[in-house]
Amino acid sequence: KSPIFGPQEVSSIEGDSVSITCYYPDTSVNRHTRKYWCRQGASGMCTTLISSNGYLSKEYSGRANLINFPENNTFVINIEQLTQDDTGSYKCGLGTSNRGLSFDVSLEVSQVPELPSDTHVYTKDIGRNVTIECPFKRENAPSKKSLCKKTNQSCELVIDSTEKVNPSYIGRAKLFMKGTDLTVFYVNISHLTHNDAGLYICQAGEGPSADKKNVDLQVLAPEPELLYKDLRSSVTFECDLGREVANEAKYLCRMNKETCDVIINTLGKRDPDFEGRILITPKDDNGRFSVLITGLRKEDAGHYQCGAHSSGLPQEGWPIQTWQLFVNEESTIPNRRSVVKGVTGGSVAIACPYNPKESSSLKYWCRWEGDGNGHCPVLVGTQAQVQEEYEGRLALFDQPGNGTYTVILNQLTTEDAGFYWCLTNGDSRWRTTIELQVAEATREPNLEVTPQNATAVLGETFTVSCHYPCKFYSQEKYWCKWSNKGCHILPSHDEGARQSSVSCDQSSQLVSMTLNPVSKEDEGWYWCGVKQGQTYGETTAIYIAVEERTRGSSHVNPTDANARAKVALEEEVVDSSISEKENKAIPNPGPFANEREIQNVGDQAQENRASGDAGSADGQSRSSSSKHHHHHH
């Protein structure tokens, strides 16, 4: 008795396809060993047609695949464009040779059955409508016209020209004639269901002189489209229901035993399980729409259906489209934290994965908004400026080639809590969802900047220090100047790192940045942060205002400085609209005066400078001759 199980017999018709599922026992060896499908010959030899090792025989080329689902302990053999030559005995099995564990499957492919020559076949999808054409002779023009549906014993009236209508067709069936043509009548039946399928007879007149026509109405449920997606990836259900339902509410539901539970609809309903990771997008006026789900979970696998109805709920007799979604746990998308926690006033560094083969793709970060049909406005991107309300506190750091980019958000408030998506303009499967939770801070922040009311005086020297706790001792500390194109890493000096003693003095750990001499372009947001290699950690931000030296000049408080930053940004946007050329991200040394200084800061500065994105120059035209940042000695 073989532990492999599957269908003993499979029958289909020419031109159609089959999907054969074979079940294997739940063991690690079985999950990873070779799966195969072979055809048994008269000699008892079984010739491999397809295997999970990538082998595909000539006769299956372009029309078959084999997919392993280790999480379900199954593998599926899909074969399309069947011919009668495919009839035969097969085995599905496991093992390095075709003599391993297997199950016998008999496949029979028959010819498409012939119908009597006088039968007209109408093939329609569920929810659609059909117009049946019923010809008759002129002498039957004044007679009663009718359409009836054949049952075992009799022919049950559907509709006739005396306006008699079967109760189950009220509001769905119409009998009419077109123009002055007195040799044909038509019956239209809308909102077709499976129960409408069957044989019909149209008739004009009575008795032996009556005109009759046989009609075979086939009502098809859409064959589910098979979707194979990786765990943590995303899926898009493209739904095309036709223009007759263009103005109806749209929905996507998931089959659950006896019902189809709505996941999302255009009336604002959304399943809480999909909060933060689903969008519904009407495409056009032809009834087309799409539903995008990110961060796929194992439990998302199942049978999905999209449809349209004024209620936004599944309704029999309305058009539908279906999918069978499989979620493969052997995913190429790395397992990242799906929840990131921060505290008010603090910061978060979110590592976003992307397809490493697409390192040059544009990276984005958007915030999922649940209102309406759901949308995800981009907050920052490699070629998208930071949204104004995130000024000074949001930046994207691209690390070309390593399959990750980092988004840092600081000065957190409880308003920032919510769902965010990492996405690129490349492989759409790599869209990932992060939930940001923000709790009220209960202790002092890890990084603190002094002085806190930072007002620098034009032409003078100005130093800011960033104090960090001993736990960050071994991490790389950095200062960067924020612009709406990124945060450009600057040369800085780590006071704590100079100490040769093994002990760590909590009070003396600081990293300083000096502006010498201070210029007007130095005004803006600066970040102090820690990182370990390419992994970014905490950050804190400070706004440095620049004032001319005046007698009795007073410090500007940070809120005024923030207001000024907003004004400055608005002015910059107005200016940049004058000349498109000036607004292009041209890689330039920015605050760095020479190559040596860039190298001193480390690889990150090189990467930032080269990318022209996250770490592109401030967008201010600075002279690099005399004014530059340098180490504080």
Epitope: F5, P7, Q8, E9, V10, S11, S12, I13, D16, S17, V18, S19, I20, Y23, T74, T193, H194, N195, A197, V219, L220, A221, E223, P224, M255, K257, E258, G302, H303, E316, T322, Q324
Partner: nanobody, 127 residues
Framework: EVQLVESGGGLVQTGESLRLSCAAS????????MAWFRQVPGKEREFVAA??????????YSADSVKGRFTISRTSPKGETYLQMNGLKPEDTAVYYC??????????????????WGQGTQVTVSS
């Protein structure tokens, strides 16, 4: 929604035959799996056989214990489902249940995957 009614059970001698029928009323499906399970008091439901209709293709499954003796059939996606039982043995004595699931999902042998069940019909095989 969907009602399943079994018939055809009864008392037979070892080696005789019986034909069970399962009539479905209510909704009609084109993507459907129909199955027969059986249960002996105090034991779990045991898979007997199943048939799937998916588009124009049909898939037939049966348990090792009944292979070559029992045949499941279904005339059309809307027709009745039959279980032809030949060469009956005393160990085939049980209540036989008809089950259905649409759309077709999961392992046909797993009773949890079915969403519609009949009331059952008793089959007794005496020696």
């Amino acid at each position: 929604e969907v009602q399943l009614v079994e018939s055809g059970g009864g008392l037979v001698q070892t080696g005789e035959s019986l034909r069970l029928s399962c009539a479905a009323s209510g909704r009609a499906f084109s993507d459907l799996r129909m199955a027969w399970f059986r249960q002996v008091p105090g034991k779990e439901r045991e898979f007997v056989a199943a048939v799937e209709w998916r588009g124009s293709s049909r898939y037939y499954y049966s348990a090792d214990s009944v292979k070559g003796r029992f045949t499941i059939s279904r005339t059309s996606p809307k027709g009745e489902t039959y279980l032809q039982m030949n060469g009956l043995k005393p160990e085939d004595t049980a209540v036989y249940y008809c089950a259905a699931v649409s759309p077709v999902v999961g392992d046909p042998r797993n009773s949890d995957t079915y969403n519609y069940w009949g009331q059952g019909t008793q089959v007794t095989v005496s020696s």
